[in-house]
């Protein structure tokens, strides 16, 4: 981080509580190109050998308010014949994300950062480690 | 969210730019139980039929500054014999996350929200939709 020389209007970096009162512009900047976003397929959830469903998680006191979470459809994976393969497990890939939660009993536009573990999709795993030869 | 009646110290929700100057406490609250966090296996990337690697993406002007990104190891999936299956593709599951980026030419603790598309893991897909029977 480039530490800008402190002025009276900037929080003091040496103060113990400087992280507790930062200013944030919540108008989302779309740094993704629309091409990149539109190329990203949303049908993997049906085409995967470990298909998943998405459930809607909404919390009006959170930013982002709406998060779609994955759940694996089956405990096993789907084989080429469309049957469940009992030697392979369908497992949830989770990611830890940061969300902003409204600080209770404070202004509606005062937030704190919280970690959240969300399911993103599923993958098919064997019970033993195999490497492609 | 309980909308607290506006006081002079709270931004006015009717103002068009109220989202552009919110206060955030960046001291991360770990709302994940240590159990949930410790139960989360990190070996799926090797055991998956669509294995992946993780690379470290660091940006000191971003919060969080370190993000681990997945890349699929192969274009195809690995079958039960450990061989690449040319009928099945290994694809990256991506998630759009929000990060905080330092506002250039501003105080070091003034941020804006940006979208970022990150690879979380890989899954194995067929070129046609199959459903488990």
């Amino acid at each position: 981080a480039v530490l800008i020389p402190q002025s009276s209007v900037c929080p003091n970096a040496e103060a113990n509580n400087f992280l507790q009162n930062v200013k944030v512009n919540l108008k989302v900047i779309n740094s993704l190109s629309s091409k990149a976003s539109s190329r990203r397929p949303s049908d993997y959830l049906n085409r995967s050998t470990s298909p998943w469903t998405l459930s809607r998680n909404e919390d009006p006191d959170r930013y982002p308010s709406v998060i779609w979470e994955a759940q694996c459809r089956h405990q096993r994976c789907v084989n080429a014949e469309g049957k469940l393969d009992h030697h392979m497990n369908s497992v949830l890939i989770q990611q830890e994300i940061l969300v902003l939660k409204r600080e209770p009993e404070k202004c509606p536009f005062t937030f704190r950062v919280e970690k959240m573990l969300v399911g993103v999709g599923c993958t098919c795993v064997s019970s033993i480690v195999r490497h492609a030869s | 969210a309980v909308l607290i009646p506006q006081s002079s110290v709270c931004p006015n929700a009717e103002a068009n730019n109220f989202l552009q100057n919110v206060k955030v406490n960046l001291k991360v609250i770990n709302s994940l139980s240590s159990k949930a966090s410790s139960r989360r296996p990190s070996d799926y990337l090797n055991r998956s039929t669509s294995p992946w690697t993780l690379s470290r993406n660091e940006d000191p002007d971003r919060y969080p500054s370190v993000i681990w990104e997945a890349q699929c190891r192969h274009q195809r999936c690995v079958n039960a014999e450990g061989k690449l299956d040319h009928h099945m593709n290994s694809v990256l599951i991506q998630q759009e996350i929000l990060v905080l980026k330092r506002e250039p030419e501003k105080c070091p603790f003034t941020f804006r929200v940006e979208k970022m598309l990150v690879g979380v893991g890989c899954t194995c897909v067929s070129s046609i939709v199959r459903h488990a029977s």
Partner: antibody, heavy 121, light 106 residues
Framework: QVQLQQSGAELVRPGTSVTLSCKAS????????IHWVKQTPVHGLEWIGV????????FYNQKFDGKAELTADKSSSTAYMELRSLTSEDSGVYYC??????????????WGQGTSITVSS | QIVLTQSPAIMSASPGEKVTMTCSAS?????IYWFQQKPGTSPKRWIY???ELASGVPARFSGSGSGTSYSLTISSMEAEDAATYYC?????????FGGGSKLEIK
């Protein structure tokens, strides 16, 4: 400016299916969910369900589960609703409306002009 | 599901008159939303998150309430306010709408 342009009125036969479209412009399509609402003189406004163009996620009012299928095409910024096994009960005006994913405080802020569906033999 | 009951179903008011319509929820909800609809047009977001006026809505409109009881008030009725007003909740699935309050000008 923000616009949700819906497809034209349809007169359809009972037992058939119909697909309605909702083309979005003037905003980033994937920042908003698309919700669908039905309006009839008898039942008033009824929420059908939601599609998230970003993830492909869908969630339905149980009443319309199996009746409606919601999809979206990110490349053309268009949302679709397919209505199946149509009966006279499905006649009505169908609206698409957008909902900001990041801050739900705003609710459903812009609506399409509506598509009238008449099911008759 | 949460049932929203609007009253009165139909009302008429003279220009300059104060108008209040209510929306009663069968269970407690966190926010109410109000939509205005005129014949042959789509609903317009009118009041969001119980209190906030949508862009372009005249200041004579206001929203209030909490829990199960909410209201929309017009401080001084004008001809252009004649329309049907619907309340809406999204605190619980399925999201629901009230049956509407039709406001006519005398």
């Amino acid at each position: 400016q923000v616009q949700l342009q819906q497809s034209g009125a349809e007169l359809v036969r009972p037992g058939t299916s119909v697909t309605l479209s909702c083309k979005a412009s003037g905003y980033i399509f994937t920042d908003y969910e698309i919700h669908w609402v039905k309006q009839t003189p008898v039942h008033g406004l009824e929420w059908i369900g939601v599609n998230d163009p970003e993830s492909g996620g869908t969630f339905y009012n149980q009443k319309f589960d199996g009746k409606a299928e919601l999809t979206a095409d990110k490349s053309s910024s268009t949302a679709y609703m397919e209505l199946r096994s149509l009966t006279s009960e499905d006649s009505g005006v169908y609206y698409c409306t957008r909902y900001y994913r990041y801050e739900s405080f705003y609710g459903m802020d812009y609506w399409g002009q509506g598509t009238s569906i008449t099911v008759s033999s | 599901q949460i049932v929203l009951t609007q009253s009165p179903a139909i009302m008429s008011a003279s220009p300059g008159e104060k108008v209040t319509m209510t929306c009663s929820a069968s269970s407690s909800i966190s926010y109410i939303y109000w939509f205005q609809q005129k014949p042959g047009t789509s609903p317009k977001r009118w009041i969001y998150a119980t209190f906030e006026l949508a862009s372009g809505v005249p200041a004579r409109f206001s929203g209030s309430g909490s829990g199960t009881s909410y209201s929309l008030t017009i401080s001084s009725m004008e001809a252009e306010d004649a329309a049907t007003y619907y309340c809406h909740q999204r605190s619980s699935y399925p999201w629901t709408f009230g049956g509407g309050s039709k406001l006519e000008i005398k």
